[in-house]
Structures are given as structure tokens and as C-alpha cells.
């Protein structure tokens, strides 16, 4: 008889999860020679060890420490790009502006981007049927704890001027409950980070408001300033033009505002 399996509210582990993680690791270390020393089998073993056989609502940051250790990577000062609720544009930007890095441009973020995973207590099986949903089931699930752990580490190691892309189309442009608002903001190190520069990305073509005056941005400024980090904010009125101008900075239309 099939063994009883816990039913969660979220979608199950991404199909072919182990081979996807291993394949991504192999590809990443091949393409990024500075990470060539990484043993992908050890990375997968550490990743697996963080959630396999564990109750999926009781995962801790400690569980991911062996993986974090293996994936240690540093970003040059002034080159960290954080984002909140605007992943696609942030990734399009770093594809073009390669000397800037989002978390998903680093090994561990690259491995897990867009994937879901969880195990079951006391078995070596991966649960492909369902995984805990952050809201409906529990926050200490394997995926949420992973992103919290690697996001904390990413913010802790940032230095110089750190940039963050924020979605100006959302009701809360800065959301204290997002990973950026709850983890990254609080783990930037004032002794290493001189400033945080927010880029507020406008959604509508005709939207000429100064979203840097939004109350949630003022709240972000207050949090950052209290941590002795300077804060700057820029409106990006035309994200399409913004990307085009990153690609072709000499273009005459790029001398005017974006």
C-alpha cells in the first residue's frame, strides 16, 4: 500500500529537481572559472542534506550552512543589485550590465531560481506532490528558509554603494514583509555600505509622479538612515528606455531623463 503522505497547500517539488540543481551547478562552474574549484556533487549533497528527512515546516537557517559555505562568493564593492517584486527587469539589467550582480547571478541563487523543493520527515524521499505554502502552511519551509539564508548572506557581504530595484506599480513600493524589507535591509553592514540607492521602476508610460516621495520610500529612507547608511532614490520613468540606454549609452535619446 502507498504510504500516507502529508498534503500541503503549495505546489510540489519541481520535477527533476536533483538533476536540475546538479546540471545548473556544472554549467555555472564551467562558465564562471573563478568557481571552477566547486565540487558540484558536494554542493548537491549539502543542498539535499538541508531538507531531506526533515519535517518541512521546521527547517532552519542552520540547515543550509554547509551549502552556504560551499557556495561562498564575493561581489566587488558597488556592484550589488538587490530587487523587490521586479525580478525580471533586474535580471535583464544584469544580463546587459554584467559587472553588477543580483543574488540569482551568484551560484546558490542560480541553482535555486524558480525551483520548489521539500522532503518528508523520516524518509529519504523528495515530495513531488505538494510542499508547504508560506502563508497557508508555514514560513519555516525549505524554500523560504533557503532564500532567507542566502539573501541574508548576500546583504551581509555587500559593500560600497548598494542598489535596489523596486516596483513602482505596487501599492507598497517598499514592503517591510518582502525579503528585501525583512532580511536584506537589516543585514547591510553600515561599516561596509556607504549608501543604498533605490531605483523606483514606473509601470505606466504616462506616469510622471515622483515616486521617491511615496510614504513607503520615506519609510525605507528612515530605516536606512537610522542604520547610518546614506539613502538616495531615482525614478526610472521608462524601464524599456532604461534598458536600451544601458545597452547603448551613447544614444542621443539617453542624454535626457529615463
Amino acid at each position: 500500500l502507498p504510504r500516507w503522505r502529508q498534503q500541503w497547500s503549495g505546489s510540489g517539488t519541481t520535477s527533476r529537481f536533483p538533476e536540475t540543481v546538479l546540471a545548473r551547478c556544472v554549467k555555472y562552474t564551467e562558465v564562471h572559472p573563478e568557481m571552477r574549484h566547486v565540487d558540484c556533487q558536494s554542493v548537491w549533497d549539502a543542498f539535499k542534506g538541508a531538507f531531506i528527512s526533515k519535517y518541512p515546516c521546521n527547517i532552519t537557517e542552520e540547515d543550509y550552512q554547509p551549502l552556504v559555505k560551499l557556495g561562498t562568493q564575493t561581489v566587488p564593492c558597488n556592484k550589488t543589485l538587490l530587487w523587490s517584486r521586479i525580478k525580471d527587469l533586474a535580471h535583464q539589467f544584469t544580463q546587459v550590465q554584467r559587472d553588477m550582480f543580483t543574488l540569482e547571478d551568484m551560484l546558490l541563487g542560480y541553482l535555486a531560481d524558480d525551483l520548489t523543493w521539500c522532503g518528508e520527515f523520516n524518509t529519504f524521499e523528495i515530495n513531488y506532490q505538494s510542499c508547504p505554502d508560506w502563508r497557508k502552511d508555514c514560513s519555516n519551509n525549505p524554500v523560504s528558509v533557503f532564500w532567507k539564508t542566502v539573501s541574508r548572506r548576500f546583504a551581509e557581504t555587500a559593500c560600497g554603494v548598494v542598489h535596489v530595484m523596486l516596483n513602482g506599480s505596487r501599492s507598497k513600493i517598499f514592503d517591510k514583509n518582502s525579503t528585501f524589507g525583512s532580511v536584506e535591509v537589516h543585514n547591510l553592514q553600515p561599516e561596509k555600505v556607504q549608501a543604498l540607492e533605490a531605483w523606483v521602476i514606473h509601470g505606466g508610460r504616462e506616469d510622471s509622479r515622483d515616486l521617491c516621495q511615496d510614504p513607503t520610500i520615506k519609510e525605507l529612507e528612515s530605516i536606512i538612515s537610522k542604520r547610518n547608511i546614506r539613502f538616495f532614490c531615482k525614478n526610472i520613468y521608462r524601464p524599456d528606455k532604461f534598458l536600451q540606454c544601458v545597452k547603448n549609452p551613447e544614444d542621443s535619446s539617453c542624454l535626457s531623463g529615463i
Partner: antibody
């Protein structure tokens, strides 16, 4: 703007060697793989190999391991490919092409260098 | 080495039609597949990477799908500028290209 400017057409004798260049501009040369691709007239594309200027890492298609040599001069942001012991089979257009951030596709291409091998 | 088998080798279609080109890899390439368009006498142009991601600037009528060893490129509502030769490429290992699909105006 990313640009890859390749050297001009080459006419060479069988048995000779040729060295073609690919000058890169508009990006940090040392941070991307530079690949080379062969296309014979009216034929398919063939990957020859890739070179990482940041540390001179090189990868070759086994078929071209003894045929092509990939190098680069970082001070001038120029990649080179030398083809040796030329035969008629080497008559083709050769493209230099740059990978994207994680080398998941060849996002930028040079205009191609035509090599004609003829006695 | 992984071989890439592309089909059909040629295809005639009219402006406004939808066409699909397929590519089969001889081994699992883990979604590391790219599609290119090449016009006569020009360099290839990247249309899709990671099997389904469109680079900035590629029209949304192009879409990629597939996984494992089977992949496809779909072009909705063909435009006059879409005619040319299409290649798939395995980006997983050794960057091998498919044999190409020549898309001609009917």
C-alpha cells in the same frame, strides 16, 4: 553598445596558416567567454571553441583541437583564432560570438571573416 | 557528443500563419537550448535561450518550449521579416547546432 569587429577576407594556400582577429568593444572584455563558430557556404553552424580572457581558460570542440588555436590580448580587447594546415574543408565564414552572462546563448556576433583556401 | 536533430529541414508558410520547428537532442540537455535566426549573408541572431527565455528586444510572437531532449520554437502570426533559416543549439555541452530549418514564403 556591444560590438565585435572581425578582420577582413583571407585567401590562403593549402597547408598554410591564417590568424584572424575579433576586436571587442562596449563591455568588459575579460568577463565574458568569446566563442568561434564556423559556417561553410550553404551549410550549418559548427562550434569551434571558446576562450575566457579573464584567465585564458580555453575549451575546444574535439574536431577542431588540432586545427584551431584561440588566444586573446586583453590590453586591446582583441580575440584571435589561428587555423593551421589549411585544406579546402577550411574554406568558410568564421564568426566570433560572445556568450551572455551565464553563457546560455550567443548574444552578440561579429560580421564574420571569410577564409578561402585555394591553390 | 550530443547531436541535435532539427525538423523540418525546410518549411513554406504565409504571412499571418503559425509555424513550429522542433529540435531533438541525443541526450538530456537540461533546458540549455538556444534558438537563432539567420538571414542570407548575415550573422545569426539569438531568439531564445534556456529553452524558453526571450532576450530583450525579441518580439513576443516567438516562443520556446520543451525539456529534457525535446524542444520546439513556435512563431505566431508570421511577419515578412521572419523568413530565413532557424537553428537550435545545445548550450549544455559542446555547443552543437541543429541542421537548420529554412523558412520560406509560400
Amino acid at each position: 553598445e556591444v560590438q565585435l569587429q572581425q578582420s577582413g577576407t583571407v585567401l590562403a594556400r593549402p597547408g598554410a596558416s591564417v590568424k584572424m582577429s575579433c576586436k571587442a568593444s562596449g563591455y568588459t572584455f575579460t568577463r565574458y567567454w568569446m566563442h568561434w563558430v564556423k559556417q561553410r557556404p550553404g551549410q550549418d553552424l559548427e562550434w569551434i571553441g571558446g576562450f575566457y580572457p579573464g584567465n585564458s581558460d580555453t575549451r575546444y570542440n574535439q574536431k577542431f583541437k588540432d586545427k584551431a588555436k584561440l588566444t586573446a590580448v586583453t590590453s586591446t580587447s582583441t580575440a584571435y583564432m589561428e587555423l593551421s594546415s589549411l585544406t579546402n574543408e577550411d574554406s568558410a565564414v568564421y564568426y566570433c560570438t560572445r556568450g551572455d552572462r551565464h553563457d546560455e546563448g550567443f548574444a552578440y556576433w561579429g560580421q564574420g571573416t571569410l577564409v578561402t583556401v585555394s591553390a | 557528443d550530443i547531436q541535435m536533430t532539427q525538423s523540418p529541414a525546410s518549411l513554406s508558410a504565409s504571412v499571418g500563419e503559425t509555424v513550429t520547428i522542433t529540435c531533438r537532442a541525443s541526450g538530456n540537455i537540461h533546458n540549455y537550448l538556444a534558438w537563432y535566426q539567420q538571414k542570407q549573408g548575415k550573422s545569426p541572431q539569438l531568439l531564445v535561450y534556456n529553452a524558453k527565455t526571450l532576450p530583450d528586444g525579441v518580439p513576443s510572437r516567438f516562443s520556446g518550449s520543451g525539456s529534457g531532449t525535446q524542444y520546439s520554437l513556435k512563431i505566431n502570426s508570421l511577419q515578412p521579416e521572419d523568413f530565413g533559416t532557424y537553428y537550435c543549439q545545445n548550450i549544455w555541452t559542446n555547443y552543437t547546432f541543429g541542421g537548420g530549418t529554412k523558412l520560406e514564403i509560400k
